[in-house]
Interface confidence: low
């Protein structure tokens, strides 16, 4: 059905990372345009990118409003030029993306280690708390902030001279962990959501190594 | 077990001023926004203000009806949060709660059992 | 500051019966509001988010509606355990809490 000039878009897909999300579809249009509808399932359908000739539309302001809803959205078709003609059966195609749940599937972004402070044979390693884009009373929410304790931390350790790595995992954004005196260690960390089944862990963290800029060092 | 224990509450005269604590437990402080929040006898809830976590640069904000004479600041290293509260009126006379603030849903989930303050002639 | 009128200030029902309460905010606040429910010698304890979403663990005869200025919260069916005082929160622009509704049993 529909006019035919205009084809329904597919490949419906959800771009989320720390919330920020955007949702992406084909075919790039060829004398046609898109709108973007988005709704709670037990909501009104709000429309975004109004007759954009883009592919992608980014949501992140709507879902923001309440991260543990579930999202629906649709794309519609319309013909360049003529926005108001629609198809066949009285309305313009339009294409269901999946259901998405941000809590439960933005992806985690890649975590930095802020620093890392040794003190005899003992390390500090403090991961940074990345900033999301979900707003509150006029600031925007870190990771911990949104997800409390189901967000850990695990890091990953080894002395620069070989490669054997040891990991520590925390749900708070510290470590306390035990090394050799003398010796210098590498550090890498990776962000955890234990009880998703999907998109559970983040890329590692770039590794960071005692010895450089990074660390702050006093030996006791 | 997470525990809040407010200190500092008694009488003081209108134009006074009183410093309340609240001493924290079981949680990792520093992580957490933290907010005050009265109730005057026979009223209801009031929020006071809130300083945010260290992530956050400890920011305060407050309500309009004690900004400029209150001023709420934090320890971590001591776990504590504190109120200091200045050129007090007979309408601040009321219970004063410190709760953990959740900020992404506006959650008080745990709360102290309260001081009183009296601001009486 | 925001302001938030809650009624009524307080409201007698029969067990089983359905109650509702509303809160009205001086100026739109798209849908950030929470209910709270306070019990003598207890922390005020958050059964809704976000206008509608129930927190975890709350019993489904809890339900919250509307947007913009005008929030509704309703209780289905009335238990025992329901006594208490009821707050709404707007947290769209700082924090302000309604004046409260004192819930009793008939």
């Known amino acids: 059905s529909g006019t035919t000039n205009t084809v329904a878009a597919y490949n419906l897909t959800w771009k989320s990372t720390n919330f920020k999300t955007i949702l992406e579809w084909e075919p790039k249009p060829v004398n046609q345009v898109y709108t973007v509808q988005i709704s709670t399932k037990s909501g009104d359908w709000k429309s975004k990118c109004f007759y954009t000739t883009d592919t992608e539309c980014d949501l992140t302001d709507e879902i923001v409003k309440d991260v543990k809803q579930t999202y629906l959205a649709r794309v519609f078709s319309y013909p360049a030029g003529n926005v108001e003609s629609t198809g066949s059966a009285g309305e313009p195609l339009y294409e269901n993306s999946p259901e998405f749940t941000p809590y439960l599937e933005t992806n985690l972004g890649q975590p930095t280690i802020q620093s890392f402070e040794q003190v005899g044979t003992k390390v500090n390693v403090t991961v940074e708390d990345e900033r999301t884009l979900v707003r509150r009373n006029n600031t925007f929410l870190s990771l911990r902030d949104v997800f409390g304790k189901d967000l850990i931390y695990t890091l990953y350790y080894w002395k620069s001279s070989s490669s054997g790595k040891k990991t520590a995992k925390t749900n708070t954004n510290e470590f306390l962990i035990d090394v050799d005196k003398g010796e210098n260690y590498c550090f890498s960390v990776q962000a955890v959501i234990p009880s998703r089944t999907v998109n559970r862990k983040s890329t590692d963290s770039p590794v960071e190594c005692m010895g450089q800029e990074k660390g702050e060092f006093r030996e006791i | 077990e997470v525990q809040l224990v407010e200190s500092g509450g008694g009488l003081v005269q209108p134009g006074g001023s009183l410093r309340l604590s609240c001493a924290a437990s079981g949680f990792t402080f520093t992580e957490y926004h933290m907010s005050w929040v009265r109730q005057a006898p026979g009223k209801g809830l009031e929020w006071v203000g809130f300083i945010r976590n260290r992530a956050q640069g400890y920011t305060t904000e407050y309500a309009a009806s004690v900004k400029g004479r209150f001023t709420i600041s934090r320890d971590d290293s001591k776990n504590s949060l504190y109120l200091q509260m200045n050129s007090l009126k007979t309408e601040d006379t009321a219970v004063y709660y410190c709760?953990?603030?959740?900020?992404?849903?506006?959650?008080?989930?745990?709360w102290g059992q309260g001081t009183l303050v009296t601001v009486s002639s | 500051d925001i302001q938030m009128t809650q009624s009524p200030s307080s409201l007698s029902a029969s067990v089983g019966d359905r109650v509702t309460i509303t809160c009205q905010a001086s100026q739109d606040i798209n849908k950030y509001l929470n209910w709270y429910q306070h019990k003598p010698g207890k922390g005020p304890k958050l059964l809704i988010y976000?206008?509608?979403t129930l927190q975890t663990g709350v019993p489904s005869r809890f339900s919250g509606s509307g947007s913009g200025t005008d929030f509704t919260f309703t209780v289905s069916n009335l238990q025992p355990e329901d006594i208490a005082t009821y707050y709404c929160l707007q947290y769209d622009n700082l924090l302000t809490f309604g004046q409260g509704t004192k819930l009793e049993i008939k």
């Open positions: 976000y206008t509608s």
């Open positions: 709760a953990r603030l959740t900020m992404v849903v506006a959650e008080f989930d745990y």
